[in-house]
């Protein structure tokens, strides 16, 4: 066996093993997404977070899982069976993914102001319509999750919530915000949030069902809440995690480039190996 053949063999099995790993990873992501979609209640009790934006993330995970599985399967079978058409398709898909990432990166950096405006509009609309449609809670749950994770409240300020009639108290006690704005760490009791949330909603899997106005959890805006708007919170988060984000993106990009190079190298050199083998027959 020549050096070229052993090199190709190494590339072939390297591609196979790595893509097999990504296939397993994709199937796990897919199964996770389907689990959330089918059985929200047990997922909520397992994770212990009441307002993870399940509806959106279950679909995102399922689609991402299928996509990852699809690409990995092309790489696996293409490399193992030495099928040029599959390797070409694998290369094409990776190229498409890489081009999409590059395009998104350019768009994000050049259209930043426009993206911020669009995001603000979406958030403001979500806040305005909060709790009005019990059937469409995905955006609300997502925003609640953002507030809870980024430790912020509203888009500009917590006062963004004061126009939401469903949250409003009576007379002088009008100013209320959703429970996702509640700062449990400020009260020396980390369970306060859960007590507050679950005592009002009384059932663990409340988000798995449609919500009614009575189900909306609200706290007084003058109590222990996050006083920073999420626009600032988001900027802080991006600033603090910029190196990580850029690192991950570069890592993924380099990984894709690596696999693309290997697949095209294998694809182009399969001919030479077959030609040489044909001469010995």
């Amino acid at each position: 066996m020549s050096a070229q053949e052993s090199c190709l063999s190494l590339i072939k099995y390297f591609l196979f093993v790595f893509n097999l790993f990504f296939f397993v990873l994709g199937s796990l992501i897919f199964c996770f997404g389907i689990w959330i979609l089918i059985d929200k209640t047990s997922f909520v009790s397992f994770v212990g977070l009441a307002f993870v934006p399940l509806q959106i993330w279950s679909k995102v995970l399922a689609i991402s899982g299928i996509f990852t599985m699809g690409i990995a399967l092309l790489g696996c079978v293409g490399a193992l069976k030495e099928l040029r058409c599959l390797l070409g398709l694998y290369f094409g898909m990776l190229l498409l993914l890489f081009a999409t990432q590059i395009t998104l990166g350019i768009l994000i950096s050049t259209q930043r102001a426009q993206l911020e405006r669009s995001l603000r509009d979406v958030v403001e609309k979500t806040i305005q319509k909060y709790g009005t449609n019990p059937e469409e809670t995905a955006a609300e749950e997502s925003w609640d999750y953002v507030q809870f994770q980024l430790r912020c409240c509203g888009w500009h300020y917590p006062q963004d919530w004061f126009q939401v009639l469903i949250l409003r108290g009576n007379g002088s006690e009008a100013h209320r915000v959703p429970c996702s704005c509640y700062n449990s760490t400020a009260t020396n009791d980390s369970t306060v949030f859960d007590k507050l949330f679950f005592s009002q909603l009384s059932r663990l899997g409340h988000l798995a069902r449609s919500r009614h106005s009575a189900d909306i959890c609200a706290v007084p805006a003058e109590s222990h809440i996050y006083r920073e708007g999420c626009a600032q919170g988001l900027q802080k988060w991006l600033h603090n995690n910029l190196i990580s984000i850029v690192g991950i993106c570069l890592g993924v990009g380099l990984l894709e480039l690596g696999f693309m190079t290997l697949s095209i190298f294998l694809c182009r050199n399969l001919d030479h190996v077959y030609n040489r083998l044909a001469r010995y027959r």
């Epitope: 004061f162 100013h175 109590s223």
Partner: antibody
Amino acid sequence: QVQVKESGPGLVAPSQSLSITCTVSGFSLTTSGVSWVRQPPGKGLEWLGVIWGDGSTNYHSALKSRLSIKKDHSKSQVFLKLNSLQTDDTATYYCAKGGYSLAHWGQGTLVTVSA
Amino acid sequence: DIQMTQSPASLSVSVGETVTITCRASENIRSNLAWYQQKQGKSPQLLVNVATNLADGVPSRFSGSGSGTQYSLKINSLQSEDFGTYYCQHYWGTTWTFGGGTKLEIK
């Protein structure tokens, strides 16, 4: 029912510090904000600052450097301290329940800055 | 800081009339506005919050309206106890400000 009462020194010399205590009852300082407002004689209202249920504060931007608001939960008291007083700090100082809209006001305490 | 401009500065009206006081903010305050009434020698009293929400115990003849930068307080069929000075106050952002006041006098 909700009650709010201010107690101040009445007369303060220029360049000295002003300390006013606001004693509250009928509500909890952990869930409600308490605001401070002043009104110079014959003039309009001027917002000074607020202390929230969690102890965080917001101050009037022009007075930020000389104003501080603190509280003592156990005594149900809120304290205002204004440093380096000038004659134009002469006003009736009010403390009120509420951080955003001010639902219950004290009767106010008149503070005169004079030598 | 956001400036609040109240108008008119003063007005004379008779009992039973309807009056409207306006308040203009220097920028969008997103309905984060309160109205107060202050009688001579007394502390202010909250009438309206969140621009339109009537405070506890406030008669229904008072009503608040507006959005963005323009707000108004309307008093239908004025009673003798309604005379005094009216102030608007915004609470958008991190520092609040009051309007200059509108003095309502008996004609």
